[in-house]
C-alpha cells in the first residue's frame, strides 16, 4: 500500500518551487499534458550551451514525512538527445541528479541550505532510458522515462527534494512522493493494523476480529516488510467464538443464523439445531429445548433434547402367598434416550381400610428403583392386605421435568391367613370298631376356628374311594364303623373365616382286636 506525500499530477495551482541561481535558462514551470490528456504542472530546463560546471537547481516545497522512514520518489520525465541538438555544446548532458534535505520545519530559503551536496544528500544520478530524437524531415519522437528512487532513512519532521541539472534538455513531467506501508490485513480471523515499516522487517501483533477468540499458543504476529508487503508466514490466529462461524474467506465471524448453533470456539460451521430444540436469535452457542424437552447435565451441548418416557405398559402380577412377581412392557415413548430405568412406589391397605406407604418389611428383588429390566419380585406381603404398586419409567431427564410422573398402577390383595395345620392328634379311646381322637386348638390369626375336617383311611387302602371325611365343630371326633384290629391314617384341618388350613401330618392309629380289651387311650 502506498501513501502519497506529494503528487504533482493532482496539483491544479502553480507549484512555485524554488530555483537557483536566478538566471536565464533556469528551470521553468510550464503546463503539460499527461497520458489522459489532463493538464499538469511540469518543470522544464534546456540550457545546453551553458558554461561547464554551472548547475541549475530546482527544489520542491517542504514535505512532511508523516512517520515514514523511507520515502519513494517516482519521477516521470522526458529528455532530448544531445545528438539531435545542433547547437548543443560538449556540456550537453542526458542525466540529472536528485538530492534531498531534511529539516524539522519549512526553514529553507532562496539561498539556504547551501545549494550543494552536503548539506543536500545525494540520492542518485538519473539517466534517461528513452531520449526524444529529431531527425531531419521527421517529427520528433520519444517516450516518457519513469524512475523510482528511495530516500532515507529519514528522521526529521520533513524534507525537500531537489533536482540538479548540469546541461540536460529535459522536462520533469510529474513527481510522486510516497511511502509504503503494510495495508490492514485480516487473515485467519486475525486483524493486523496498517503499519508503516520502520526497519527492514517489523513484527506486528494481531488482534482477533469481532466475535473471535485467540487460539491456544503464542499471540498471533506477522512481519511488515520495508516494501509494504506482509511477510508470508503461517499465522496461529484466532477462531470464532461459540455461536459464530468463519465467513468471507476467514476474515470475519458471522453469527449463526436462527435455527443453527455452534457450541465451541474453533473451526467448524454452525449446525442445524438438534432434535426438539430451537434458537430464536442469531449467534446461538446452544439451542434451547422445546417446552417439555430437556438435556441432562451430562449431555453434550449439541445433543438433542429429550423428554421423560411415558408410563410402562401392561403390568402383570403373579401372587404366590406372600411373594409377588410383577412384570411389564417398556413404555411406548422412550423420550429419545437410551438410559431407561424403572422404579416402583408402593402403598398398602390393611383389612380395616387404613392405608399408608409400604413398610420396611417388604423386600424388592433386584430393588425398588434403578431397575433396568422390566420385572421385580416383592416378598414379605402380609395376608389380607391390598397393595397398590405404581410402576414408573425414568430416564436421564426425568428429574428435570415438572409435573406428575406417569405411572402404570397394579392392585394386589393377598389372601386372608387360614388356620395352621393341626398336629398333636391323640387317641383318647379305641375299640374294635371306633377311635376317639382329640387335638389342640390351633392359633388361627384371622378369627376363631369354626370347625374341623377329619380325613382318614385304612392303611394300605390308598385309592380315593377308601378316603373318608368327618366334620366336627369340637377339637375332638369319634371315628365309627372301623375294622377290627386295623391300622388307620388320620389327618385333621381347621377352618376359619379365611378358609381351611392345611391338613396336618398323618397320624397312625389302630382299632382293638376284641371288645374285652375295652377302651384304651392311645397317644399320638
Amino acid at each position: 500500500l502506498e501513501e502519497t506525500l506529494l503528487n504533482t499530477k493532482l496539483e491544479t495551482a502553480d507549484l512555485k518551487w524554488v530555483t537557483f541561481p536566478q538566471v536565464d535558462g533556469q528551470w521553468e514551470e510550464l503546463s503539460g499534458l499527461d497520458e489522459e490528456q489532463h493538464s499538469v504542472r511540469t518543470y522544464e530546463v534546456c540550457d545546453v550551451q551553458r558554461a561547464p560546471g554551472q548547475a541549475h537547481w530546482l527544489r520542491t516545497g517542504w514535505v512532511p514525512r508523516r512517520g515514514a522512514v523511507h520515502v519513494y520518489a517516482t519521477l516521470r520525465f522526458t529528455m532530448l538527445e544531445c545528438l539531435s541538438l545542433p547547437r548543443a555544446g560538449r556540456s550537453c548532458k542526458e542525466t540529472f541528479t536528485v538530492f534531498y534535505y531534511e529539516s524539522d520545519a519549512d526553514t529553507a530559503t532562496a539561498l539556504t541550505p547551501a545549494w550543494m551536496e552536503n548539506p543536500y544528500i545525494k540520492v542518485d544520478t538519473v539517466a534517461a532510458e528513452h531520449l526524444t530524437r529529431k531527425r531531419p524531415g521527421a517529427e520528433a519522437t520519444g517516450k516518457v522515462n519513469v524512475k523510482t528512487l528511495r530516500l532515507g532513512p529519514l528522521s526529521k519532521a520533513g524534507f525537500y527534494l531537489a533536482f540538479q541539472d548540469q546541461g540536460a534538455c529535459m522536462a520533469l513531467l510529474s513527481l510522486h512522493l510516497f511511502y509504503k506501508k503494510c495495508a490492514q490485513l485480516t487473515v485467519n480471523l486475525t486483524r493486523f493494523p496498517e503499519t508503516v515499516p520502520r526497519e527492514l522487517v517489523v513484527p506486528v501483533a494481531g488482534s482477533c476480529v469481532v466475535d473471535a477468540v485467540p487460539a491456544p499458543g503464542p499471540s498471533p504476529s506477522l512481519y511488515c516488510r520495508e516494501d509494504g508487503q506482509w511477510a508470508e508466514q503461517p499465522v496461529t490466529g484466532c477462531s470464532c467464538a461459540p455461536g459464530f462461524e468463519a465467513a468471507e474467506g476467514n476474515t470475519k465471524c458471522r453469527a449463526c443464523a436462527q435455527g443453527t448453533f455452534k457450541p465451541l470456539s474453533g473451526e467448524g460451521s454452525c449446525q442445524p439445531c438438534p432434535a426438539n430444540s430451537h434458537s430464536n436469535t442469531i449467534g446461538s452457542a446452544v439451542c434451547q429445548c422445546r417446552v417439555g424437552y430437556f438435556r441432562a447435565r451430562t449431555d453434550p451441548r449439541g445433543a438433542p433434547c429429550t423428554t421423560p418416557p411415558s408410563a410402562p405398559r401392561s403390568v402383570v402380577s403373579r401372587l404366590n402367598g406372600s411373594s409377588l412377581h410383577l412384570e411389564w412392557s417398556a413404555p411406548l415413548e422412550s423420550g429419545g434416550r437410551e438410559d431407561l430405568t424403572y422404579a416402583l412406589r408402593c402403598r398398602e391397605c390393611r383389612p380395616g381400610g387404613s392405608c399408608a406407604p409400604c413398610g420396611g418389611d417388604l423386600t424388592f428383588d433386584p430393588g425398588p428403583r434403578d431397575l433396568v429390566e422390566p420385572w421385580v419380585v416383592v416378598r414379605g406381603l402380609r395376608p389380607d392386605f391390598t397393595y397398590t404398586f405404581e410402576v414408573t419409567a425414568l430416564n436421564g431427564v426425568s428429574s428435570l421435568a415438572t409435573g406428575p410422573v406417569p405411572f402404570e398402577p397394579v392392585n394386589v390383595t393377598t389372601d386372608r391367613e387360614v388356620p395352621p395345620a393341626v398336629s398333636d392328634i391323640r387317641v383318647t379311646r379305641s375299640s374294635p370298631s371306633s377311635l376317639s381322637l382329640a387335638w389342640a386348638v390351633p392359633r388361627a390369626p384371622s378369627g376363631a376356628v369354626l370347625d374341623y375336617e377329619v380325613k382318614y383311611h385304612e392303611k394300605g387302602a390308598e385309592g380315593p374311594s377308601s378316603v373318608r371325611f368327618l366334620k366336627t365343630s369340637e377339637n375332638r371326633a369319634e371315628l365309627r364303623g372301623l375294622k377290627r384290629g386295623a391300622s388307620y391314617l388320620v389327618q385333621v384341618r381347621a377352618r376359619s373365616e379365611a378358609g381351611y388350613g392345611p391338613f396336618g401330618q398323618e397320624h397312625h392309629s389302630q382299632t382293638q382286636l376284641d371288645e374285652s380289651e375295652g377302651w384304651r387311650e392311645q397317644l399320638a
Epitope: L30, L33, Q37, E44, C46, V48, K134, G137, C169
Partner: antibody
C-alpha cells in the same frame, strides 16, 4: 502569458523575397513549435511550415518546399519566415503561432497552436 | 499531403440552435485533429485539440468528437459571439493541413 509580436506589413515586388519576424516574450522559447500560417484575402488558413528552435531544422508544406525558409534565433527568442520568388498570389496575412505545449511536456502532440501573432500583411504587387 | 474536407462550407443558424460541423480526412489521422475559430480581422483561436479536448478558457458548449477520418465540432447552443469561421487542422503528418473552413452566419 506569452506574446508573439510580428514585424510590420510589407509590400514586395514579384520575384523578390520577404522575411517576417516573430518575437516571443516570456519564458521558454527553444522547445515550443513555431508554425507559420498564411491567409489570402477572403480565403482560408494555409499551413506553411514549422520549426522547433532547439532542433534548428524545420518541416515545410510540400506546396512551399524550396521557396520558404523558417529559422529561429534562440538567443533573441525570435522566429523568421522567409518566402522567396514572390508572386501576386502570395499576397496574404502571414501569422506565426506557437504550440500549446513544448516538445518535452506533452504525451500527445505539440502542434496545436494556442498563441498567435497579430499577423503581418505581405502585399506582392508590381 | 493529407486533404481535409469540411462541410458545410457555410450555414445559417439562430441563437440557441445546435450546430454541427464535420471534417473528413483523406486518410487515418487517429485523433490528431484541432479546431479553430476565426473572426474577421483577427488571428485564429484554438478551441479543441486532440479531437475532443477543450482548450482552457473555451466555453463548454463547444465539443469535439471523432477518430480516424471523421470528426465533428458541435456547438450545443449557439451564442451571438459564436458567429465566425471554423477550421479543422490535422497534425498527424510532418506536414499540417487545414480544412477550407465553415462560415457560421446569423439566419
Amino acid at each position: 502569458q506569452v506574446q508573439l509580436v510580428q514585424s510590420g506589413a510589407e509590400v514586395k515586388k514579384p520575384g523578390s523575397s520577404v522575411k517576417v519576424s516573430c518575437k516571443a516574450s516570456g519564458g521558454t522559447f527553444s522547445t515550443y513549435a513555431i508554425s507559420w500560417v498564411r491567409q489570402a484575402p477572403g480565403q482560408g488558413l494555409e499551413w506553411m511550415g514549422r520549426i522547433i528552435p532547439i532542433f534548428g531544422t524545420a518541416n515545410y508544406a510540400q506546396k512551399f518546399q524550396g521557396r520558404v525558409t523558417i529559422t529561429a534565433d534562440e538567443s533573441t527568442s525570435t522566429a523568421y519566415m522567409e518566402l522567396s520568388s514572390l508572386r501576386s498570389e502570395d499576397t496574404a496575412v502571414y501569422y506565426c503561432a506557437r504550440s500549446s505545449y513544448t516538445i518535452l511536456t506533452t504525451y500527445y502532440n505539440y502542434n496545436a497552436m494556442d498563441n498567435w501573432g497579430q499577423g503581418t500583411l505581405v502585399t506582392v504587387s508590381s | 499531403d493529407i486533404q481535409m474536407t469540411q462541410s458545410p462550407s457555410s450555414l445559417s443558424a439562430s441563437v440557441g440552435d445546435r450546430v454541427t460541423i464535420t471534417c473528413r480526412a483523406s486518410q487515418n489521422i487517429n485523433n490528431f485533429l484541432n479546431w479553430y475559430q476565426q473572426k474577421p480581422g483577427k488571428a485564429p483561436k484554438l478551441l479543441i485539440y486532440g479531437s475532443s479536448i477543450l482548450q482552457s478558457g473555451v466555453p463548454s458548449r463547444f465539443s469535439g468528437s471523432g477518430s480516424g477520418t471523421d470528426f465533428t465540432l458541435t456547438i450545443s447552443s449557439l451564442q451571438p459571439e459564436d458567429f465566425a469561421v471554423y477550421y479543422c487542422h490535422q497534425v498527424s503528418d510532418t506536414s499540417d493541413t487545414f480544412g477550407q473552413g465553415t462560415k457560421v452566419e446569423i439566419k
